[in-house]
């Protein structure tokens, strides 16, 4: 047999469905099995209650990605193996990674007091996450437009040059990735 469609790397959120594709050709028609980190993957063919289904095409469908604080049964490196009595074919490796966004910010912004006309800097480091979270800022719950020439956002820093009285307010840093969003503790600019 030969593999005609190989699985691809995937990043997926906990609880979401996903599919690892695999298609094989051969005479006689090969059977397909999946292995994760070298260990055979149990599917609905082994246990009807399984959250993993072996589709007729040979693809592996996850009804929902199972992922705990410690137990991570779905995360790992997968291959599909096509077999018939003439031999076997092994697909390329595909990694299944589970997206993550923790709650706790590595660095919350802190209150800043600044004189009018002076620059102000607010700093934030988003929670740990995978993919690595990006950030944006909100002032008084409204997203800040960083296209304004006095405002620049670089890394975790919000820089306001030539501050005005109207810049005073509550600033929140928002960390975001495919999992969702997390708000930092607010910081007051006075």
């Amino acid at each position: 047999p030969r593999i005609v469609e190989h699985p691809s790397d995937v990043i997926v959120s906990k609880g979401e469905p996903t599919t690892l594709n695999c298609k094989a050709e051969g005479r006689p028609t090969p059977t397909i099995e999946w292995y994760k980190d070298g260990e055979r993957v149990e599917t609905d063919k082994d246990d009807p209650r399984s959250h993993r289904m072996l589709l007729p095409s040979g693809s592996l469908f996850f009804l929902r990605i199972v992922h705990g604080r410690r137990s991570k049964p779905d995360e790992g490196s997968y291959v599909c193996v096509a077999r018939n009595y003439l031999g076997e074919a092994v697909s390329r490796n595909a990694s299944l990674e589970v997206a993550l966004l923790r709650d706790d910010f590595r660095q919350n912004p802190t209150d800043v007091v600044v004189a009018a006309g002076e620059p102000a800097i607010l700093e934030c480091q988003p929670p740990r996450g995978h993919p690595e979270p990006t950030i944006y800022w909100k002032k008084d719950k409204v997203r800040i437009d960083d296209k304004e020439e006095r405002i620049s956002i670089r890394g975790g820093k919000l820089m306001i040059s030539n501050t005005r009285k109207s810049d005073a307010g509550m600033y929140t840093c928002v960390g975001t990735n495919m999992v969702g969003e997390r708000d930092s503790d607010p910081a007051e600019l006075t």
Epitope: K36, D37, E39, R40, V41, E42, D46, D47, V66, H67, G68, R69, R70, S71, K72, P73, D74, G76
Partner: antibody
Framework: EVQLVQSGAEVKKPGASVKVSCKAS????????MHWVRQAPGQGLEWMGW????????EFPQKFQGRVTMTRDTSITTAYMDLSRLRSDDTAVYYC???????????WGQGTMVTVSS | DIVMTQSPSSLSASVGDRVTITCRAS??????LNWYQQKPGKAPKLLIY???SLQSGVPSRFSGSGSGTDFTLTISSLQPEDFATYYC???????FGGGTKVEIK
């Protein structure tokens, strides 16, 4: 069928050691942490620690550190719990339990009665 | 260490009664709280995980609520097979409550 099957009852003398086994089947052994929980006669449940079958990492509460050892053999999908320097108050039913991806013990072994008596 | 305090330690009830068991954590555990049922001579059985999610195959008369430090297991209409001991367990760092024995009145 997903199940955990434990070794049989043991009778030990104070000061001896006991090794209880837990054979896992029907699921990917290395994907789920394995915990050990014990229950003295007429008492509640007491957590003893966990092992990550993927790499052998372990964690125990302070009470059991230095006296409990948890190991695994991935080739036969079996986890082991070894308790040394046994005392009479170690008399209990010992359970292995799989920690699910929902952070709960969804599958339990049938239990192994360990009696420590002189 | 996080200490889990369950109350009451025992209760008597009749078939059809609504039964409530509470569990309090010594510090916040978010929703990392599970409930188990144990019958004499048997291993515990998972009923509720993550404070309020019903484990597959468990009857809907069982429900869980709470977050932070205070949690509740409710049996809406007690059935003969529900007479057992119930344990809460926090999976933040792992420890069990002392158990609640539900007996026939």
């Amino acid at each position: 069928e997903v199940q955990l099957v434990q070794s049989g009852a043991e009778v030990k003398k104070p000061g001896a050691s006991v090794k209880v086994s837990c054979k896992a089947s029907g699921y990917t052994f290395t994907g789920y942490y394995m915990h050990w929980v014990r229950q003295a006669p007429g008492q509640g449940l007491e957590w003893m620690g966990w092992i990550n079958p993927k790499n052998g990492d372990t964690e125990f509460p302070q009470k059991f550190q230095g006296r409990v050892t948890m190991t695994r053999d991935t080739s036969i999908t079996t986890a082991y719990m070894d308790l040394s320097r046994l005392r009479s108050d170690d008399t209990a039913v010992y359970y292995c339990a799989r920690e699910s991806g929902d952070d709960a013990f969804d599958i339990w072994g049938q239990g192994t009665m360990v009696t420590v008596s002189s | 260490d996080i200490v889990m305090t369950q109350s009451p330690s025992s209760l008597s009830a009749s078939v059809g009664d609504r039964v409530t068991i509470t569990c309090r954590a010594s510090q916040s555990i978010s929703s990392y709280l599970n409930w188990y049922q144990q019958k004499p001579g048997k291993a515990p059985k998972l009923l509720i995980y993550a404070a309020s999610s019903l484990q597959s195959g468990v009857p809907s008369r069982f429900s869980g609520s709470g977050s932070g430090t205070d949690f509740t297991l409710t049996i809406s209409s007690l059935q003969p097979e529900d007479f057992a001991t119930y344990y809460c367990q926090q999976s933040y760092s792992t420890s069990f409550g002392g158990g609640t024995k539900v007996e026939i009145k």
